[in-house]
């Protein structure tokens, strides 16, 4: 259940997250499963553990194997396994199937290709993108944050896309590449002004002090894949990341669901260890696309 496959190329950086995730304050110990030997935490080592992350800087083919992570959570020490395979670099242009990440689909209206696993790394923009080993050039291609946007997508744009970036660790730079297939769908869709399904406008959500609470912002934006659509939370009119309260976090990555053929997104706001002062805040669920922005406000009240 808590085992994960990870792969990389020799002489590149590879960072693996423990499949058994705990809270940030929990200690995580890493071991070579075969020898039960502890993996060091000192950064001077080529392979070292850093909390929930196991870092190969850079990776070698001999690093392949199963690694055990033990999360020192209360009551139980919980175990996860990372099955790591490091491959030799290919001399030709073909990227073998075993190095491919999940395929993504796009259409004329939406052509985002996310760079796989990039969230684990300390990288700075811009990303370099390649299609079938050729560097992408031209105004149709835009590298934006951790994804590539292709304007006016055509069926010929299908193929294997590789992102390349630099991971920085204590001033040293390491190259990372990741490849995924992109397919093009012919889709007759439309977009409309965002419709927020939850929460209701001016909703009062009952919470218990000291416990965790989740608020879900859910909105639909039209039919088919949407080119630009987003849902997010604000606290007192401020972005969550700027608000500076570590107990209150948005769930990373927006879930895309299709309800009755409609393209919908939701974003979960997680409030850990609810405090009295959280009841004083204004929680805004924002949904926006090319048509505009809609806002629904929620307030918290103490459960009796």
């Amino acid at each position: 259940k808590f085992s994960k496959q990870s792969w990389g190329l020799e002489n590149e950086a590879l960072i693996v997250r423990c499949p058994r995730q705990g809270k940030p304050s929990y200690t995580v110990d890493w071991y070579y499963s075969q020898t039960n030997k502890s993996i060091p935490t000192q950064e001077r080592n080529r392979v070292f553990a850093s909390g929930q992350l196991l870092k190969f800087l850079p990776a070698e083919v001999a690093d392949s194997g199963i690694y055990t992570c033990i999360v020192r959570s209360p009551t139980f020490n919980r175990t996860g396994y990372a099955n790591v395979t490091i491959y030799k670099k290919q001399s030709d242009c073909n990227v073998p199937d075993y190095l491919m990440y999940s395929t993504v689909s796009g259409s004329e209206k939406n052509s985002k290709i996310y760079c796989p696993t990039i969230d684990l790394y300390n990288w700075t923009a811009p990303l370099e993108w390649f299609k079938n080993c050729q560097a992408l050039q031209g105004s149709r291609y835009r590298a934006h944050k951790s994804f590539l946007v292709i304007d006016n997508v055509m069926t010929e744009d299908a193929g294997d896309y590789t992102c390349k970036f630099i991971h920085n660790e204590n001033g040293a730079n390491y190259s990372v590449t990741a490849t995924r297939s992109f397919t093009v769908k012919d889709e007759q869709g439309f977009s409309l002004f965002p419709v927020i399904g939850a929460p209701a406008q001016n909703e009062i959500k009952e919470v218990e002090i000291g416990k965790n609470a989740n608020l879900t912002c859910s909105a639909c934006f039209g039919k088919g894949t949407q080119f630009l659509a987003a849902v997010l939370w604000q606290l007192n009119g401020t972005k969550i990341t700027d608000f500076g309260e570590p107990r209150i976090q948005q769930e990373e990555g927006q879930n895309q669901s299709f309800s009755n053929g409609l393209a919908c997104l939701d974003m979960v706001l997680r409030i850990a260890d609810v405090k009295e002062e959280d009841l004083l805040l204004q929680y805004d669920c924002l949904a926006l696309n090319l048509h505009g922005l809609r806002r629904h406000t929620v307030r918290l009240s103490r459960k009796n």
Epitope: P74, R78, N212
Partner: antibody, heavy 122, light 111 residues
Framework: EVQLVESGGGLVQPGGSLRLSCAAS????????MHWIRQAPGKNLEWVSA???????YYPGSVKGRFTISREDAKNSLYLQMNSLRAGDTAVYYC????????????????WGQGTTVTVSS | DIVMTQSPLSLPVTPGEPASISCRSS???????????LDWYLQKPGQSPQLLIY???NRASGVPDRFTGSGSGTDFTLKISRVEAEDVGVYYC????????FGGGTKVEIK
């Protein structure tokens, strides 16, 4: 209503086997750590075994190798297979809910069953 | 293994009067997340145990506010501000830092 109901207790001879079941309802069973806790007649509470949401199992030395805890999330059920039973295993066995192993939230052992009696005697 | 020691073994009480039970652990129950993994349970005669206090000082849902948990590190206390007749039974402390270990119990009975 959040509820745990144990069954399967009874009289068994030393060296025999017994399988206890616990039916859970009223909560998302699959995300919780679950425990078996026992109480010998007139004695204190003793932790017997636990299973987390991944299916990893935990036992004290006194029952390791003899007892096996398991769960069937699709049926909201917890089990305890007890082999090589001894007179010292005679007790009321409680099924109990632990922390939320998904979110790592702990609110105590907050739900207990009514208990099922196991008697090991010749 | 963490060993839990409770005192007193027996506690005769007068309704309306306060009562206090002590619990000591063989090692600190403070986890790296900042919480003390110490709970208090009450087992009334003929019943299953019920949770009173979790994480050292948090009252469980539905527990009257006359029950208060306090303490840190290895020393913890359960206080009943004004004992009522329904409070009789055996009180157990339990650590949940490393698996589960129960204290020996304190029998509270009306004088």
């Amino acid at each position: 209503e959040v509820q745990l109901v144990e069954s399967g207790g009874g009289l068994v001879q030393p060296g025999g086997s017994l399988r206890l079941s616990c039916a859970a309802s009223g909560f998302t069973f699959s995300t919780y750590d679950m425990h078996w806790i026992r109480q010998a007649p007139g004695k204190n509470l003793e932790w017997v075994s636990a299973i987390d949401l991944a299916g990893d199992t935990y036992y004290p030395g006194s029952v390791k190798g003899r007892f096996t805890i398991s769960r069937e999330d699709a049926k909201n059920s917890l089990y305890l297979q007890m082999n090589s039973l001894r007179a010292g295993d005679t007790a009321v066995y409680y099924c109990a809910r632990g922390g939320d192993g998904y979110n790592y939230d702990y609110y105590g052992i907050d739900v207990w069953g009514q208990g099922t009696t196991v008697t090991v005697s010749s | 293994d963490i060993v839990m020691t409770q005192s007193p073994l027996s506690l005769p009480v007068t309704p309306g009067e306060p009562a206090s039970i002590s619990c000591r652990s063989s090692q600190s129950l403070l986890h790296s997340d900042g919480y003390h993994y110490l709970d208090w349970y009450l087992q009334k005669p003929g019943q299953s145990p019920q949770l009173l206090i979790y994480l050292g000082s948090n009252r469980a849902s539905g527990v009257p506010d006359r029950f208060t948990g306090s303490g840190s590190g290895t020393d913890f206390t359960l206080k009943i501000s004004r004992v009522e007749a329904e409070d009789v039974g055996v009180y157990y402390c339990m650590q949940a830092l490393q698996i589960l270990t129960f204290g020996g119990g304190t029998k509270v009975e009306i004088k």
